[in-house]
Interface confidence: low
Amino acid sequence: FVRTKIDTTENLLNTEVHSSPAQRWSMQVPAEVSAAAGDAAVLPCTFTHPHRHYDGPLTAIWRAGEPYAGPQVFRCAAARGSELCQTALSLHGRFRLLGNPRRNDLSLRVERLALADDRRYFCRVEFAGDVHDRYESRHGVRLHVTAAPRIINISVLPGPAHAFRALCTAEGEPPPALAWSGPALGNGSAAVPSSGQGHGHLVTAELPALNHDGRYTCTAANSLGRSEASVYLFRFHGASGASTHHHHHHHH
């Protein structure tokens, strides 16, 4: 099977004279890997290359965000003939090589996942020495991090005409649905996505008018769990006070 489109950007200086005609540069990665926040994830990446029996120096690299230009999160180097790829970079110490680059395997393990890790990752291998060649996954593997809801902020703020309003911001993946409950509340709550923060995992709900003193509770829920936080409103002489109270419920 041969494609009609030729891409020279991913197959540079492919000069090994003993290359096998049956092999070419290619990388195999899943388009997506899913894992829960706090857990570990494996990003598989295997490759083929035309340089038969290559045992010269090599470097394995993983970068995040975009191919070729994204920031590196992991890098290791193996000396000529060595099966050991010495780690030179592991961002926050959470990335480690599972595969053996000498065996065409660059699979990576990411520890202690956070929602901020939800992005695309790209593996790359570089040969040096007698052969100078390199290849990088162009599409990469998307790491999808799931998380039960967590309310990260709940507050009461001054509103128009000496009234008060409440804001509740939660994070989670899938993005949680937010609901307010409180004294004499009708359909006053409104959940709106936040302005692009946190890779879209943040959701904010505003309660535009707090007309009664008492406890107002924000509930965030998704398929993985539920979280609640409350704010107490009490008014005297035009001032307000508030205290907060949190509950988390995880579905197992």
Epitope: F1, D7, S26, V29, A31, E32, D105
Partner: antibody, heavy 122, light 106 residues
Amino acid sequence: QVQLKQSGAELVRPGTSVQMSCKAVGYTFTNYWIGWVKQRPGHGLEWVGDIHPGINYTNNNEKFRGKATLTADTSSSTAYMQLRGLTSDDSAIYYCARVDYDYDGSYIMDYWGQGTSVTVSS
Amino acid sequence: QIVLSQSPALLSASPGEKVTMTCRASSSVSYMYWYQQKPGSSPKPWIYATSNLTSGVPARFSGSGSGTSYSLTISRVEAEDAATYFCQQWNSKPWTFGGGSKLEIR
């Protein structure tokens, strides 16, 4: 040349299980993913899941979780799919296909088996 | 999941005519892929990454589109083009296919 040879047609009873095979020849089995696709008349094509024999890693369509189990035997370059708890909805042709995930900037199922027909009937 | 809707489901054309079939995605995808299937045969990869023809596909075929709308066009239909064409996305799991557009030659 590259070929994927699938096992023959199956006629099975409701509630039972069936295992079909997909033997790969003409390429390095551990370097590529093998995907499985279901085709029912009037229902188009449906991705069931795929497996990378080299790292024993699987992707699954949640719809088929508990229904389909994918395995691979690298010694015989053969991929397997087992379907259990069979009902009439499982009657279909099941294809295996080699998945070229990242070469030349694209993904594609580049070689397909001839299909295994499964008929569930009492 | 991303739902791919193909139209028309059935189209009939005479040799030499130009035909276009479309594939609409329920949410934006980066690329679209097309497969050709003839009765009694397995699907064959036909167009990859929206507009690139696989080896052996005649130049009268072309693919285009972006976002949620993609199309496959045959500039001058020939009898051998009679088949069902499926679109497919690799953007997010589960990978999904369209319901197919069946091309008949009059």
